[in-house]
């Protein structure tokens, strides 16, 4: 049987001779050279050679455990003469023994990390990791210990975990933002003779809101013309903040001062400036100088830094209003006047008033824009602005007159203003009602008394304040006749009724009925309209057959009698 089990071989042999591994030996070997040892398997004949007579095994090359820690080979012992095995083939291993020939290597050449400024001591920053290729199961060749070579007193590293933490209180990004830390990893548990590797950790302090905004000056002064429309920017102010990003964002507001009604401040999000703008129309003549208190504040405040003081600052803004020569200003944006349509010429309707708003208070003259009053219906007193009629009015022709009045500075005619003037013509009951249409109606010769032959309607050009009320009657001169009557229906209609049985068209072919129509308003208006009634021949159903005068045998008569 074989006299071995496994062999151990130290890696990285540096001797000039082959490295002796061990000896294969069978108890069948009598030492007479009759046995022959044969080696096969991992590296046999190349890496490992055997003396076929003695069974001595040697390694021909330097071995590296980290490359291959175990070799599996097979051994044979055969009769040299017959070639027959004297032992069954057997497997054995060569185990490569570790030496500390590998330094720890970090997973990254350079680490980058961030940590908030002003972080508490011991705040986690980053964990670095180094690996050692040596055998961790044997000795301390792979036992790594971390230490800081550069970066103290700001940071520390946990020796066993490689966790880097802050080591100094109140690290201020605004003082220093970047740190380069060098970490060493050493094997052999950090003992003398151990191998080591290093890595660089670039640490950036991130910003926290630990700085308030600050105005670089306590007072600002701007000028703006009084003509600046609302929304006009008149100046920019900027508070500085040592922080960055949202911690440096600033909101501006007007907190006090006599001008906070007149001005606004808006924040320019890109430049973080406060833009002072006009909020309401300015008037040099009313106020020439405004003083505002403007505040700059951080909208994003960290409560834990509130003890550092208020995160806001204020400055005084002085705004000087410059005078602008302005046109006259009317007392109203538009004037609405009323006048009765029966007003006589030169009737005063009302007046307009304009004033030079400038300190000079230049006198003003008034005129009517004739493009808006081509017919010269109205006039204006150039001195006092009184509007009066220069022609007669008629509401039924035009209800509203829309004219424009101009006010011009006498000393500076270039400065003028216009104002619309809406003149409503009030209704006077000055139109009589009249028939809604021309009425020509027909009556059958055989008509019976009290037969309705026509319904009358009237219209009135006057303003139907709530609807006209009309009355109808036969004119007095016709009322005594007994041919037709009018029945006022009291609903603004009236009916013409026959007043007798039968009409003879040979005697009278046409009747002209004068009808008086009156409105029930004041002043009372009435008119007389004429209704023509033709006498016709009809069939027994009452259908007209012949009404024409030329069809009659006898000369026709024409009567105004009703």
């Amino acid at each position: 049987s074989w006299m071995w089990n496994q062999f151990f071989l130290l890696e990285e042999y540096t001797g000039s001779d082959y490295q002796y591994v061990g000896k294969l030996h069978s108890d069948q070997d009598r030492g007479d050279g009759s046995l022959k040892y044969i080696l096969s398997g991992d590296g046999a004949g190349d890496l490992f050679i055997i003396n076929e007579n003695t069974g001595d095994i040697q390694a021909t090359k330097r071995l590296d455990r980290e490359e291959k820690p175990v070799y599996i080979l097979r051994a044979q012992a055969v009769n040299r003469r017959t070639g027959r095995p004297v032992e069954p083939e057997s497997e054995f291993i060569i185990k490569i023994h570790d030496i500390n020939d590998n330094e720890p290597i970090f997973t990254k050449d350079v680490y980058t990390a961030t940590v908030p400024e002003m972080a508490d001591v011991g705040t986690f920053v980053v964990q670095v990791t180094a690996t050692d290729a040596d055998d961790p199961t044997y000795g301390n060749s792979a036992k790594v210990v971390y230490s800081i070579l550069q970066g103290q007193p700001y940071f520390s590293v946990e020796s066993e975990t490689g966790i880097i933490k802050t080591a100094l209180l109140n690290m201020d990004r605004e003082n220093r933002e970047q740190y380069q830390v060098v970490i060493q990893a050493k094997d052999m548990g950090g003992q003398m003779g151990g191998l080591s590797g290093t890595t660089t950790v670039n640490i950036t302090l991130t910003d926290v809101n630990d700085n308030p905004p600050r105005f670089p000056q306590s007072t600002y002064q701007f000028k703006t013309p009084e003509s600046s429309p609302p929304g006009t920017p008149i100046g920019r102010i900027k508070a500085s903040d040592a922080d960055v990003g949202e911690n440096a964002e600033i909101e501006y507001s007007i907190t006090d001062g006599e001008g906070h009604e007149m001005f606004d401040v808006i924040t320019d999000q890109e430049t973080q400036e406060g833009i002072i703008t006009v909020k309401k129309l300015l008037d040099f003549e009313k106020k020439k100088v405004y003083t505002l208190k403007v505040e700059a504040s951080n909208p994003h405040v960290e409560p834990r830094f509130l003890y550092l003081g208020p995160f806001k600052d204020s400055a005084t803004v002085r705004i000087v209003v410059d005078d602008v020569d302005e046109p006259p200003v009317f007392s109203k944006l538009a004037y609405i006047l009323q006048i009765r349509e029966d007003a006589r010429i030169n009737t005063t309707i009302g007046s307009v008033a304009a004033q030079d708003p400038d300190a000079a208070r230049n006198p003003v003259k008034y005129s009517v824009d004739r493009h808006t009053d081509m017919d010269r219906i109205f006039n204006i007193d150039s001195g006092n602005g009184s509007i009066f009629t220069s022609k007669l009015l008629d509401r039924e022709t035009l209800l509203w007159h829309n004219i424009t009045v101009i006010a011009t500075e006498i000393n500076n005619p270039k400065q003028s203003s216009r104002v619309p003037l809406y003149i409503k013509v009030l209704d006077v009951n000055d139109n009589a009602p009249e028939f809604a249409e021309f009425y020509e109606t027909f009556v059958c010769e055989k008509a019976k008394a009290d037969q309705l032959i026509q319904t009358l309607r009237a219209v009135d050009k006057d303003d139907p304040y709530s609807g006209h009320q009309f009355s109808f009657s036969l004119a007095p001169e016709a009322a005594s006749s007994s041919n037709f009557t009018i029945q006022d229906n009291k609903d603004n209609t009236a009916g013409i009724l026959t007043r007798k049985n039968g009409y003879n068209r040979h005697e009278m072919s046409t009747y002209l009925l004068p009808v008086v129509i009156s409105d029930n308003d004041y002043p009372v208006q009435s008119s007389t309209g004429t209704v023509t009634v033709r006498v016709c021949a009809c069939d027994h159903h009452g259908n007209m057959q012949s009404c024409h005068a030329e069809a009659l045998i006898h000369p026709t008569g024409l009567s105004t009698g009703a």
């Epitope: 009765r340 009030l426 209704d427 006077v428 009951n429 303003d463 304040y465 709530s466 609807g467 006209h468 009320q469 009355s471 009657s473 007095p476 009322a479 006022d488 008086v516 009156s518 029930n520 308003d521 004041y522 002043p523 009372v524 009435s526």
Partner: antibody, heavy 118, light 111 residues
Framework: QVQLLESGGGLVQPGGSLRLSCAAS????????MNWVRQAPGKGLEWVSV????????NYADSVKGRFTISRDNSKNTLYLQMNSLRAEDTAVYYC???????????WGQGTLVTVSS | DIVLTQPPSVSGAPGQRVTISCSGS????????VSWYQQLPGTAPKLLIY???NRPSGVPDRFSGSKSGTSASLAITGLQAEDEADYYC???????????FGGGTKLTVLG
Amino acid sequence: QVQLLESGGGLVQPGGSLRLSCAASGFTFSSFAMNWVRQAPGKGLEWVSVISSSGSNTNYADSVKGRFTISRDNSKNTLYLQMNSLRAEDTAVYYCARPSYFQAMDYWGQGTLVTVSS
Amino acid sequence: DIVLTQPPSVSGAPGQRVTISCSGSSSNIGSNFVSWYQQLPGTAPKLLIYDNSNRPSGVPDRFSGSKSGTSASLAITGLQAEDEADYYCSSYDSFDHSWVFGGGTKLTVLG
């Protein structure tokens, strides 16, 4: 049905003022002109004043011109007569009346007595 | 001041016919319609005749009106005791846009 109801009469000293009201119902008040007519004790009827349907036109008897003012509020269906600088000869029953068919006064109120006396 | 002229009083026995005249001018009766009012003692006037000769509903046909030129008249036939009242004629005046009344006529039913 049409109704006219006067109020506001009473005893007043010469030079004093009174305001009469006439509440109308049963018709479209704003479509009709309206009259005040008075009747002194034992005397005949005397027309006093008229106002157009919209209130824009008014007229007065010479005897009251400059002292009396007629007005109306169409939203309240009410006619008014403001009487200032009253005289003894203004003592009368005051009627409001609606002029209709060809200016005939078809409806009258029951009247309100105004007495001007010291 | 009274513009239309009426007789102060008229009388008649029951069943009789009486007429009351009313005269004016061209600016009132001459160019406008006449209306007549009846005023019973202690009551408001009541429209009796309009448009010269028309009767409002409810007025008996014993009452009739007429107009000629600048005059008008009211006729009452079949006189009854309840007709005893004051009667006034009236017209619109186109000259000064006012209403004018007669001085009133007291009708007495005899017996």
